[in-house]
Structure formats: structure tokens, C-alpha cells
Amino acid sequence: DGCKDIFMKNEILSASQPFAFNCTFPPITSGEVSVTWYKNSSKIPVSKIIQSRIHQDETWILFLPMEWGDSGVYQCVIKGRDSCHRIHVNLTVFEKHWCDTSIGGLPNLSDEYKQILHLGKDDSLTCHLHFPKSCVLGPIKWYKDCNEIKGERFTVLETRLLVSNVSAEDRGNYACQAILTHSGKQYEVLNGITVSITERAGYGGSVPKIIYPKNHSIEVQLGTTLIVDCNVTDTKDNTNLRCWRVNNTLVDDYYDESKRIREGVETHVSFREHNLYTVNITFLEVKMEDYGLPFMCHAGVSTAYIILQLPAPDFR
């Protein structure tokens, strides 16, 4: 069928709660493309009816909720004008007690389930909640060993638990819980996080280093498509978020209507002492309003920008 196969890493998920996976593979999904989800090489696409427990929601596949029998390989087919890519995602579902956050024995757990706090520092844990816009998430509650976390050292800020003056006793099994509302129905989302404590400042200290961009301008013709990578080195155990912003707003939110400028999916390469992260920004069509505006790459406390400028006229 001429589609190029791309295999994603396994996702390990908890039964009886919502789960969503977004089919994005930049730069493939940055232009005019159609996305269709399938299960286990079935010829029949996943339903787009929002009342279905499993359905496609724009580029997402959404499980409301995930069930034991949903394990398997899912494919999303991305068709462009001149291209076709088939992305394979292996989903493994496991049973979990409500407060049971000790999931370290499972193979290939993603970094979302294993996080690190730095001893003596003010640090944070992140509750990774990836859902389409049709899902509304309520405030997040945090637990440790099945009990609610409280105390002056702990502050809940959006999807993060801020921990001031991290101590060795902050290691252990945490869970973050949120209520998700979709089409008037409510579901509970509970993510387990195994937390360890490190004294290491790690590679280049604990502040992420933005390799590119370097606060510079880029010459680009009006109307062209442009993709710019933000390359960041950071410790292997970091909990920093990396993103692109404009006017202090996430680009995906700022251009929510037109979707003309989008942030790509983050990738990373592991080295012995650190990770190299890449997250791109795609301008589907550069417009006049984009020139002179700083587009900021953020990585934890570090920032760097690019400014688009029109090429100088060629008088030859």
C-alpha cells in the first residue's frame, strides 16, 4: 500500500481509566494530512463516534476508559498529498490498585512514571495528562503511599507538585489524580510516579542548556514553510518541561484557531551523562505578522529565541 512504517516505543497503561494517544510525527503531520486510526492491522478504522468507548478524536485515539482487553498494536495512518506513513503503537494494559504507585517492576516504564527530586533544592513532580481538547481536566490531587500529600513544603501548581527544600524522605511512591470530563461523563485519571532522590547536579549542573537557537534572527521568505529545532541538553533525571512560546503563551494555544504555527513532538537521544532533547516549531506558512516577533524556546529556567526577518533585497 506504499505506506512507510514507523514503530513507536511501547506504552504501558493502567486499566479502568481514560487514556489518549496523539498521532503526531512532525514534519509529516505539519501540512494538510488525514489521520486514521486502526487496531491490530484491522481494515476497519477506529470509530469517530464520540459516544464509543474507543474513538478517534481529531488526530487522537481516545479510550474512555481503557480496559484489560485493549492491549495490542494500534496503527495510525497519516496520508499527505505525496506521502503515507503508518505509525505502530504497542499498548499494554495492566491492572492497578487505586493507590498502588509501585510500578517500578514493570519493564520499559517511561520517564513519566519515574521522576527524580534533587536533594536540598526546590523541585517539582509533573502529572503527565495527555488528552485532546474535548477532555476537560479538573484540579489535580497528589498522594503518597495512598494518603493525600499536605504540608507547607508542598504546593500544587497546575499539573505540577512543587516540593521545597527536598529531603531524602521525599522518595517513595506518589500518585496524581484528576477528574476528566468528556461529553458530560466523568472519569478518574490516576498516574503513579516512583520518586527517587539524587544529590547529583549532573551534566553541566541542573540548569538545562539550550544548544540551539542562540537568540538570533533567521531570514525567511514570506509564504514559505519553516521548521526550527530547539536542541537542549539536560540531566537524564530532569523533570524540566521544554516548549515553544510566543507572547508568553504556548504556540499551540496562541495559534489554536489557525494551527498555522505548531509545536512538534519532543524526541530525545540518550548519552551516558545527559540527554539531548529536540522539540521543533513549524510555521506552515510564514506571514508578515511573524516577522520581528521573538519565538521563545523554554527548557526549565533556560530560554532562547529566534526572530524571523525578511531576506535583504538582492540588488545584483
Epitope: K96, H97, W98, C99, D100, T101, S102, I103, G105, K144, D145, C146, N147, K150, G151, E152, R153, F154, N165, S167, E169, D170, R171, G172, N173
Partner: antibody, heavy 116, light 107 residues
Framework: EVQLQQLGAELVRPGASVMLSCKVS????????MNWVNQRPGQGLEWIGM????????RLNQKFKGKATLTVDKSASTAYLQLSSPTSEEYAVYYC?????????WGQGTLVTVSA | DILMTQSPSSLSASLGERVSLTCRAS??????LNWLQQAPDGTIKRLIY???SLDPGVPKRFSGSRSGSDYSLTISSLASEDFVYYYC?????????FGGGTKLEIK
């Protein structure tokens, strides 16, 4: 180093109440739950209840309602268990155990003897 | 309340022997289970946290595992100081409950 200090023994008259203390050092007292557990002579361990020093939220084993009261003194980093009108049934060793992670650290225990 | 059934209640074994103690939970507790050791003077020490995580300073001969609702503490090679009492403790839901205990005796 984390330490939970308890007195070795308390003698109490029947019908009088007794207050057991557990002084904490080595961690942020107001950040984690504190448990109380007892053990009658030759018996196993039994959970009495727990308290969070930050806001004094208490969860008590139904079996000890009306018998046990949990309190804290944040300034002294000390947790207390008060036993009201103890009888020979309350003759036991009482342990405090902190849940920095679940029941991570234990006090040495206080032996409560009820005697006229 | 969740009932924790611990077996055996007593066990005679020799130095260097491998032994396993078991606790069965009457309801789902996930991995929210600890193993505790109680010395003759009454001192209690946690050995295993969250079913299988070994506490710092605890010898590697101790290990914890789970099969369904059965939880095991295994001592791979008994040392003289291991002949004491052991308890399991579930902290999945209150009231938290303990197993009845196992007295490990030297043969």
C-alpha cells in the same frame, strides 16, 4: 538521622488517662503522617490511627474511637497519643511510626502498665 | 477491614537455609505492603517497602515479591540475627492491618 523518641514505660492508675509522646528529629515533622500502633503482651501488632501534623487531620481505627485521641505539637515536633480511662485491656506497648514513606521509621515503644 | 493471613506462624530453620514467609490479602491491596522485623527487645524495623523495595541498609539476602494476592518475604541464606519475628503490613486502605506474625526459630 531520623529518630522517633518515646519514653520506655508509663504507669497509669485504672480510670486515669495517660498521654504518650513521640518526639521526632531528622525530618520535616509537618510534611508526613504519623501512625500509632499497639502490641499486647505475646500478641501481634494493631494499628490505632494516624495524624497529619500539618493540619491535625486524624484517621482512627473504629476499634479505638472513644479510647484514643491523637494530637501534635508542631513547635516541639512531637506527636501524642492519649488513652482515656485505661483498663487492663490497654496494657500494651505503644509505638509511633512515621510515614515519610509508609511506616518507614518506628519509635522504640512505650510500655503502658495499668495498675492500682 | 482487610484481613492479612500470615503463614507459617512459626518456622524452624537452619543457618544458611533459604526460607519464605507468606501473607495473603483478603482484598486487593495492589503493592501497598511492607515487611517488618521485630527484635526480641521489641525494636521494629522495616525491611521491605511497597512489596519489593528493599530499605536502605537491609541486607540483600532479604527480598519481597507478589503473586496475585499472595505476598512473600524470602531470606536467601539465614544469618544468626534473622531468628526473630516478622510481620506483614498493608497500607492500601485504613484501618491498616498486620499479619499475625511469624516466629523464625533456629533448628
Amino acid at each position: 538521622e531520623v529518630q522517633l523518641q518515646q519514653l520506655g514505660a508509663e504507669l497509669v492508675r485504672p480510670g486515669a488517662s495517660v498521654m504518650l509522646s513521640c518526639k521526632v528529629s531528622g525530618y520535616f515533622f509537618t510534611s508526613y503522617w504519623m501512625n500509632w500502633v499497639n502490641q499486647r503482651p505475646g500478641q501481634g501488632l494493631e494499628w490505632i490511627g494516624m495524624i497529619h501534623p500539618y493540619d491535625s487531620e486524624t484517621r482512627l481505627n473504629q476499634k479505638f474511637k472513644g479510647k484514643a485521641t491523637l494530637t501534635v505539637d508542631k513547635s516541639a515536633s512531637t506527636a501524642y497519643l492519649q488513652l482515656s480511662s485505661p483498663t487492663s485491656e490497654e496494657y500494651a506497648v505503644y509505638y509511633c511510626a512515621s510515614s515519610t514513606t509508609a511506616f518507614a521509621y518506628w519509635g522504640q515503644g512505650t510500655l503502658v502498665t495499668v495498675s492500682a | 477491614d482487610i484481613l492479612m493471613t500470615q503463614s507459617p506462624s512459626s518456622l524452624s530453620a537452619s543457618l544458611g537455609e533459604r526460607v519464605s514467609l507468606t501473607c495473603r490479602a483478603s482484598q486487593d491491596i495492589g503493592n501497598a505492603l511492607n515487611w517488618l522485623q521485630q527484635a526480641p527487645d521489641g525494636t521494629i524495623k522495616r525491611l521491605i517497602y511497597a512489596t519489593s523495595s528493599l530499605d536502605p541498609g537491609v541486607p540483600k539476602r532479604f527480598s519481597g515479591s507478589r503473586s496475585g494476592s499472595d505476598y512473600s518475604l524470602t531470606i536467601s541464606s539465614l544469618a544468626s540475627e534473622d531468628f526473630v519475628y516478622y510481620y506483614c503490613l498493608q497500607y492500601a486502605s485504613s484501618p491498616y492491618t498486620f499479619g499475625g506474625g511469624t516466629k523464625l526459630e533456629i533448628k
